[in-house]
Each structure stands twice: as structure tokens, then as C-alpha cells.
């Protein structure tokens, strides 16, 4: 009797998660990514904000920059020059789009402990970076690129045609930032800093999205962004390279575009330096099923870049678009001509291939009914990559090492058995020459970051183990999570189910489907999270399910490319199929089923609610796409083709939320959007609302004034509180 009484008292001290816990970030975790500066040294910002240099081999550490210096300019970020003579300090951070921001930069001279005076940097700067060797600086100011030989020198202006919203040099425009490069920069130093490559984006002919920003003034401001929607005029891109030692000699030299790409609309997709005098550019046709990788060499005699046809490698997809979400980038080997790259094998699984001369003669390095996800590093004798091979769980990530110095190459899983229950989803960060590396485990247990020897894989030390979080969770009744699969009509639907702490299979529970479902996404992952849905399960007794249906990633091309040219069909069908299977499990109250999603997930949740199945009582769409004609060209056309009569206009028209307005009559619908959403424009929700009003369908709506796609800050609290009330009302749960 006594043990059970003790057990009960322990149970009584346990508490459920509260919404406040989630909104306050009480159970957030930390990761540790070393800022590598050599094979055996890294920088890290300590808890008291000193910048500390750690030497793994000597075990010594010392402060290179004090928190006092950081605070003197209100620095929120820093960057050490490769020659270790200077540090840039970043302050006045001002966010623009997803990756882009402007900031003020100060240069601190470590040799004399003073800020560099004279020839100070202008403000605000759009992007700044050190050369890979020495302490040259490249920066972008007012859409033009400048070079500094040393921080105290006057700048050399490389471009002169930069113009707001018209010509972008060294930084991407909106669509390239969000949908192609996924960076705030579009300039790349050669390995030793001899050359600087950059992109110029000409947005002169792109239609502009305009929306009101209400602010606090008497009149709202109008925000104008050149934003190509599906089928519209796209940015015109050109790539230039300039010699940074003699920048005025011949000036920036344009890199030629492969003829087969230049014959119609095209994109530049990435640039990879191989050596100081060899560069690799990737190009993509506007119809994104053909990608060309072009290797170019510097011609000293002409001071130009030569891209011979023999060094063009074509990647083409016959079943969908090229690549996964993006076309993969090459990782070059030490011979500076052959490279490793991930692309689909003959069975339709993304795997690592070694290309020496032609893509046709590529040697497949990995194979199986799983996918290689990222190549981290290639050294003289090893290749490190991540995959979801282990135990056939697509939502896991383990790190592998292939020995490429020996034949046949041997493969070793570095992470599979380290902390098997706690850690099934890893990423890694390597020092120079992979002498050491950090592993960052994201779950399913509490995240942990560790340091390892690159030769032996031996764990050297724990960098971050989230002890405080572990202690804080000791008296919390967390929901149970399970990852399983459904086999339906030759399709495998992996799902994650989040169950209330005292889950009882004989009882009936309300079900909430959380959906994203976008092409090449993955929601069912073995990662740790204490978030809103954890609270809904822990405190409100809901069952939450996430399902990866057709169109999602890392399970082969058959699943991935199933949605090609017909977005909004199979993603929705598969959520509905899963719900029916969940009902069959016996513990779901089929009168209390809801669905919610954000962005692409808002689109899918809206279509699911309007599917006419009668399965869903209610649902929420946050910042949904409502018609693919309203979304960005680069993203939309990748999966849908063009909205023209001779291409795919019919499906563009058939796949809108508005076309299904009538079907919302029998569900409770909550539509939410930020009015300053630069990504999925408020227009999308405005059109849904208009269609519902025209159909005389009642619905609920919430807008967030001056908020973007992320609905951040105080809006986040309001949003989740509002959605919680809506769901509790829908599920008849007392407040």
C-alpha cells in the first residue's frame, strides 16, 4: 500500500502544461553550435556575453572580446576576421524579410583594443562579411557593393546602379531571398579572397505588391515590394566576378549563362567556389525540371571567366521538378573538378552520387529505400552525410561517415547508437578538415549538443545538455508521443500522435489534426517540442495528429512528386484518409474533430474543411494561400507549372479555396491573417472572406494589424489564446 500512496502523491505534484507555459517559452531548449575558426578552435558567446575562444587541443579558453565592449555599441552579433585582427560588431538590427535585415556595424581592432576610427562604415548596412583570408570587407549599402582592403581604408565602390526595389547588387530581391537562395546575401568570396562573385537582380519590370502599413501616423504608409506572382514577369539575374586586389583593372566580369538555359526564362540557383580561379554556378529553367551545373575557369590572358560546354552538367526530372525543395549543391573533392551531389537514383530515391566527368557516368555512393539528406563535409578520406536510413523511420536523422580513401568504401553510422532513445534526429557542424565536430541532437528526448573527435568519433565533452529544462519538466505531465505508419492503397502515411498524459484507449477524445503538407516538407519528425499542441494534449485532453501524406519529403520521388501540377488534391485526400483510420482506432470522438494549419497548412486545412466529407466539426486557417495565382512565381511554378491556357491554368482555377465557399456552410471556420504579410499576402484571406460573404456563409475571422507571416510578438499570445478559445468552444470543453 505504501508505495502506491507515494506514487499517488507524486502524481498529485505533477501538473499539466498551461497555455502560459507555452507563451512564455518556459520549456524552450538550447543548442550549441560552435563558431569554428580553425581545425581545433571555436568561438562562443558565454552566458555573460563575453566572446570566448576555445582551443580543444590545449583545453584552454580566453576572452577575445569582453561583454563591456559588446555593450558599448549595443552589439547583438559579432564576426571575427580570419586573420584575427578585427571583429565586426553588429547593432541596431532591423528585420526586413525572412533572412534579410539591416544593421549598424562597428569594427574593433583587437591589436590595440580600440574601435577603428576614420572611414567608418555607412549605416544602415544591408550585408557585411569578411574575406575568407585576411581582413578584407565586402558590404552592401543602398543596393550597391563596396570593398575595403582593410577596415580602416576608404571603400572601393564596385557597383553603381543599385536602386531601391529596382536593382539589387549582392543581396537578393524578395523572391530570390525567400524561394531560391534562402539567404540575405548574394555575394560569395573565393576561397582565398582573390575574387568576389555577386548577383545583380533587375526587378524593373516586376509587378509590385502594395499593402498598407497602419503604424501610428494619421495616414498609413504603403509598402511596395516587387513580387512576381505565378506567371508574372520575373527578376533578371546576372552574375559578375571582380578581382578584389585590382578591382578597377577590368572591373566586374559577367559569367556567361549556359546556352540551353539562356534560351528562355531562367533562374540562378547557387554559386560554389571550387578554387580561387574555378567557380561552379547552378542555373535552372523557369519551368523547373531542368537544372544546369556549370564549372567556369578564370582566363588570365583575357581576365574573363570561361564556362566550357564540356563542364556543363545537366540534371533533369521526368516525373516532377528538379531536386527536392531546392536543387542540391555540389561538394567538391580535393581534385577541384569532381564532386559529390545528392539527386534521384533510378529507383526514385535521393542519394549521393560522385560525378567525375558526366552525370551519366556518376557513381552512386549511397543507395536504398531511404534518402540521403545532406552532405556535411568531404575530406581527403571521409564523407560525412545525414540520412533517414536507420531502422526505416523517415522522420529520423543520423550522421554517417563513408571512407572514400579505401575501396570498397565502408560506411559507419556515427550517431545511431549514441543515445538511442533520447537522440534520433541529429545535425552536425564540422571544424576545418573535419578535425572535430559538434553533434546537435534535437530529440525525441531533451536536446543535447556534444563535441567529438573527427578521426575517432569519440565524444570529447557535452556542450549543452539542457539540465535546467530537464529539471523544470520533472513535475510536468507531458503528453505521450508516438510515431507510426498507416498503409493505405500502396501509400505509406507516417503520422505522429500526441496523446493526453492519462490516455485511455477505451475512452473517446477530441482530435485535432495539425497540417502543413507543403511539397518537400516533413512534419512527422523525431524531435523534442513543448508547444501549443503539447498543451492541448496535456491540459485540454485532446489527441493531436500530424500526418505526412503525398507531396512530403524523404520517402522517395513517388510520394514527393505525386502532387506535381495538382496541388491541393492528394495532400487533402491523405489527411482525410488518415482521419478515417484514426476513427477506426476507436478512441476518437468522431463528432469532435478539427483541423488547423498555417501558410500551406492553412490552405490544406481550408480545403479539408471544404471537402464535404462531414468529418470536421471546425478548423482554423492561419495566413493561408487561397489561390496559387496569388503566390510567388518561383515556388508556385516549381510545383504547378504556369497559369496559362496551354499549361496548367485549369488546375490553378480548380484548386482555389474560394471555389469551395459553399462547402464551408457546415463547419465552424476561423480565418486568421496578418495585414502586413509580405509572403502570403492578406489578399488571400480577403478573397476567401469575400467568397464566403458572397455565398452567405457564416465564419469567424481575426486579422493582425501590421503583422507579417510570422505573427510575432504580442500577436503570438493573442493568436494562440484566440485559437484555444475557438477549439475549446468547438469541442465543448469548459474554459
Amino acid at each position: 500500500l505504501r508505495p502506491s500512496r507515494v506514487h499517488n502523491s507524486e502524481e498529485n505534484t505533477m501538473r499539466a502544461l498551461t497555455l502560459k507555459d507555452i507563451l512564455n517559452g518556459t520549456f524552450s531548449y538550447k543548442t550549441f553550435f560552435p563558431n569554428w575558426i580553425s581545425g581545433q578552435e571555436y568561438l562562443h558567446q558565454s552566458a555573460d556575453n563575453n566572446i570566448v575562444l576555445y582551443n580543444i587541443e590545449t583545453g584552454q579558453s580566453y576572452t577575445i572580446l569582453s561583454n563591456r565592449t559588446m555593450k558599448s555599441v549595443n552589439a547583438s552579433n559579432y564576426g571575427l576576421s580570419p586573420d584575427r585582427q578585427f571583429v565586426y560588431l553588429e547593432s541596431d538590427y532591423s528585420k526586413l524579410w525572412r533572412y534579410s535585415y539591416t544593421a549598424t556595424y562597428y569594427i574593433y581592432d583587437l591589436s590595440n583594443g580600440e574601435f577603428v576610427r576614420g572611414n567608418e562604415l555607412p549605416r544602415p548596412i544591408q550585408y557585411l562579411c569578411w574575406s575568407p583570408v585576411g581582413s578584407k570587407l565586402a558590404y552592401v549599402y543602398q543596393n550597391n557593393i563596396y570593398l575595403k582592403q582593410r577596415p580602416g581604408d576608404p571603400p572601393f565602390q564596385i557597383t553603381f546602379n543599385g536602386r531601391e526595389n529596382k536593382i539589387f547588387n549582392g543581396i537578393p530581391d524578395w523572391v530570390y531571398e525567400e524561394e531560391m537562395l534562402a539567404t540575405k546575401y548574394a555575394l560569395w568570396w573565393s576561397p582565398n579572397g582573390k575574387f568576389l562573385a555577386y548577383a545583380e537582380f533587375n526587378d524593373t519590370d516586376i509587378p509590385v505588391i502594395a499593402y498598407s502599413y497602419y503604424g501610428d501616423e494619421q495616414y498609413p504608409r504603403t509598402i511596395n515590394i516587387p513580387y512576381p506572382k505565378a506567371g508574372a514577369k520575373n527578376p533578371v539575374v546576372r552574375i559578375f566576378i571582380i578581382d578584389t586586389t585590382y578591382p578597377a583593372y577590368v572591373g566586374p566580369q559577367e559569367v556567361p549563362v549556359p546556352a540551353m538555359i539562356a534560351s528562355s526564362d531562367y533562374y540562378f540557383s547557387w554559386l560554389t567556389w571550387v578554387t580561387d580561379e574555378r567557380v561552379c554556378l547552378q542555373w535552372l529553367k523557369r519551368v523547373q525540371n531542368v537544372s544546369v551545373l556549370s564549372i567556369c575557369d578564370f582566363r588570365e590572358d583575357w581576365q574573363t571567366w570561361d564556362c566550357p560546354k564540356t563542364q556543363e552538367h545537366i540534371e533533369e526530372s521526368r516525373t516532377g521538378w528538379a531536386g527536392g525543395f531546392f536543387v542540391s549543391t555540389p561538394v567538391f573533392s580535393y581534385d577541384a573538378i569532381s564532386y559529390y551531389k545528392i539527386f534521384s537514383d533510378k529507383d526514385g530515391y535521393k542519394h549521393i552520387h560522385y560525378i567525375k566527368d558526366t552525370v551519366e557516368n556518376a557513381i552512386q555512393i549511397t543507395s536504398g529505400k531511404w534518402e540521403a539528406i545532406n552532405i556535411f563535409r568531404v575530406t581527403q578520406d571521409s564523407l560525412f552525410y545525414s540520412s533517414n536510413e536507420f531502422e526505416e523511420y523517415p522522420g529520423r536523422r543520423n550522421i554517417y561517415r563513408i571512407s572514400i580513401g579505401s575501396y570498397p568504401p565502408s560506411k559507419k553510422c556515427v550517431t545511431c547508437h549514441l543515445r538511442k532513445e533520447r537522440c534520433q534526429y541529429y545535425t552536425a557542424s564540422f571544424s576545418d578538415y573535419a578535425k572535430y565536430y559538434a553533434l546537435v541532437c534535437y530529440g525525441p528526448g531533451i536536446p543535447i549538443s556534444t563535441l567529438h573527435d573527427g578521426r575517432t568519433d569519440q565524444e570529447i565533452k557535452i556542450l549543452e545538455e539542457n539540465k535546467e529544462l530537464e529539471n523544470a519538466l520533472k513535475n510536468i505531465q507531458l503528453p505521450k508521443e508516438e510515431i507510426k505508419k498507416l498503409e493505405v492503397d500502396e501509400i505509406t502515411l507516417w503520422y505522429k500522435m500526441i496523446l493526453p498524459p492519462q490516455f485511455d484507449r477505451s475512452k473517446k477524445y477530441p482530435l485535432l489534426i495539425q497540417v502543413y503538407g507543403g511539397p518537400c516538407s516533413q512534419s512527422v519528425r523525431s524531435v523534442f517540442a513543448v508547444n501549443w499542441i503539447s498543451y492541448l494534449a496535456s491540459k485540454e485532453g485532446m489527441v493531436i495528429a500530424l500526418v505526412d501524406g503525398r507531396g512530403t519529403a524523404f520517402q522517395g520521388d513517388k510520394l514527393l512528386y505525386a502532387v506535381y501540377r495538382k496541388l491541393g488534391v492528394y495532400e487533402v485526400e491523405d489527411q482525410i484518409t488518415a482521419v478515417r483510420k484514426f476513427i477506426e482506432m476507436g478512441f476518437i470522438d468522431e463528432k469532435r474533430i478539427a483541423i488547423w494549419g498555417w501558410s500551406y497548412g492553412g490552405y490544406v486545412s481550408s480545403l479539408a474543411l471544404a471537402s464535404g466529407t462531414g468529418l470536421f466539426k471546425c478548423g482554423i486557417a492561419v495566413a493561408p494561400v487561397s489561390s496559387w495565382e496569388y503566390y510567388a512565381s518561383v515556388y508556385t511554378e516549381r510545383f504547378m507549372g504556369l497559369p496559362t491556357k496551354d499549361d496548367n491554368l485549369e488546375h490553378y482555377k480548380n484548386s482555389t479555396v474560394m471555389a469551395r465557399a459553399e462547402y464551408f456552410r457546415n463547419v465552424d471556420y476561423l480565418l486568421i491573417h496578418g495585414t502586413a504579410d509580405d509572403n502570403v499576402h492578406f489578399q488571400n484571406s480577403a478573397q476567401i472572406a469575400k467568397a464566403l460573404v458572397n455565398a452567405q456563409v457564416d465564419f469567424q475571422a481575426m486579422w493582425y494589424s501590421d503583422q507579417n507571416h510570422g505573427l510575432s510578438g504580442l500577436s503570438t499570445n493573442h493568436l494562440y489564446t484566440h485559437m484555444t478559445h475557438f477549439l475549446k468552444q468547438c469541442f465543448s470543453l469548459s474554459d
Epitope: D153, F156, A248
Partner: antibody, heavy 118, light 107 residues
Framework: EVQLVESGGGLVQPGGSLRLSCAAS????????MSWVRQAPGKGLEWVSW????????GYADSVKGRFTISRDNSKNTLYLQMNSLRAEDTAVYYC???????????WGQGTLVTVSS | DIQMTQSPSSLSASVGDRVTITCRAS??????LNWYQQKPGKAPKLLIY???SLQSGVPSRFSGSGSGTDFTLTISSLQPEDFATYYC?????????FGQGTKVEIK
């Protein structure tokens, strides 16, 4: 503080040789293009030669090509100009200057006078 | 080679005057044009680089403008220490060339 100090000037006979030196301090010498500029008495400025940061790349004015050789020793932070087959028209004050970005001369030495006369 | 032609070759002006010196290149040099001041027995001193950028420490009464082939140096209000010879210089193609100079004398 950037300093450039020239030395090695003097009187030399036509056809003779002279080696000028320029000692640099106050900046990272090995990172910059360096140059020689001359000024004949009462005349304007004339660029003579430049040398790249690593020392492998050089440029010369047509008037001195084949006779003058520019070099540098980055370990000693020193720039040199070897002048052979000197002519009367080479008489000038020779300035050592830093040629920033290969475009403008941002720092100059005080100059050293070379007189070519019999 | 790119030839640089300065005008006038000399000028007389008084303290407080606005002085303009022009420089023309024989072909387009974009904005790779620099201005120097030289006083007797001294080394030249950089005033303006890249056509319009003021070198650190140079008084703001000096300004530069132009691009392509035609450039101007302006001294908004001539000071006693500004009496000197001024040279323009182009920095294209790693073959720097100077103008013949403009001597600014006291009226």
C-alpha cells in the same frame, strides 16, 4: 600612422644604375599594391611602376619598361625600384606611394631625388 | 594610354572664392578619377577619390563630381592654405595617368 620613407636617391651618370628603397610602416604592407611615381623638376606627376601585394604581378609605364624593375620584400616591409640604363630624362623626385585598389594613391612618401647627369 | 586634360592650367583667386577645376579623360573612366593637392617641396596629398568621395581628414569645402569623361573639383570657399597645384588622376586598367596640373595662385 602610415609612413613611407624613400632612400637611395642621388647623382648618377647616364647609363648607370640606382636602387631606390621605400620602408613602410603603420599598415599591413603585404596586403597592398605599392607604386613609384616621379616628378621631374618643375613638371607634373608621372606614374612609373606598381607591384601587387604578393609581388608576382607588376606594371610599368612605357617610358621605363625594360629598364626599371620593381620588387618588394614583405618580410621587411620594403619596396624597391631597380633603375638601370638611366637617362637624363629620368631625373626626378621619386615618390613611393600606396596604390589603393590599383586606383588611387592614398599615402605618399616624402620623395627621394634622382639626378642623372654626366 | 588614357590622356587626362586639366583646365585651366593656372588660375588666380581670392580667399573666400569658389574655385572650379575641370578634368577631361580621352575615354570613359567610369568614376575612377582622383584629385590631389601638392604644395612646393612636398609630396602630393589625396583629396578626392572615386570622383566624389572625400578622403578622410580633408575639409568639406573640397568636393568632386562627374563620371565617364568629364570631372570637376570644387573648392567652395578658398582658404589661404589652399593655394597649391591640383592634379587629377585616372585609375583605370592599372595604368594610372595624371593631368598636367592646375596651379591656384593668390590674386
Amino acid at each position: 600612422e602610415v609612413q613611407l620613407v624613400e632612400s637611395g636617391g642621388g647623382l648618377v651618370q647616364p647609363g648607370g644604375s640606382l636602387r631606390l628603397s621605400c620602408a613602410a610602416s603603420g599598415f599591413t604592407f603585404r596586403g597592398y599594391i605599392m607604386s613609384w611615381v616621379r616628378q621631374a623638376p618643375g613638371k607634373g606627376l608621372e606614374w612609373v611602376s606598381w607591384i601587387g601585394p604578393e609581388g608576382s604581378r607588376t606594371g610599368y609605364a612605357d617610358s621605363v619598361k625594360g629598364r626599371f624593375t620593381i620588387s618588394r620584400d614583405n618580410s621587411k616591409n620594403t619596396l624597391y625600384l631597380q633603375m638601370n640604363s638611366l637617362r637624363a630624362e629620368d631625373t626626378a623626385v621619386y615618390y613611393c606611394a600606396r596604390l589603393l585598389y590599383g586606383t588611387w594613391f592614398d599615402y605618399w612618401g616624402q620623395g627621394t631625388l634622382v639626378t642623372v647627369s654626366s | 594610354d588614357i590622356q587626362m586634360t586639366q583646365s585651366p592650367s593656372s588660375l588666380s583667386a581670392s580667399v573666400g572664392d569658389r574655385v572650379t577645376i575641370t578634368c577631361r579623360a580621352s575615354q570613359s573612366i567610369s568614376s575612377y578619377l582622383n584629385w590631389y593637392q601638392q604644395k612646393p617641396g612636398k609630396a602630393p596629398k589625396l583629396l578626392i577619390y572615386a570622383a566624389s568621395s572625400l578622403q578622410s581628414g580633408v575639409p568639406s569645402r573640397f568636393s568632386g563630381s562627374g563620371s565617364g569623361t568629364d570631372f570637376t573639383l570644387t573648392i567652395s570657399s578658398l582658404q589661404p592654405e589652399d593655394f597649391a597645384t591640383y592634379y587629377c588622376q585616372q585609375g583605370r586598367l592599372l595604368l594610372p595617368t595624371f593631368g598636367q596640373g592646375t596651379k591656384v595662385e593668390i590674386k
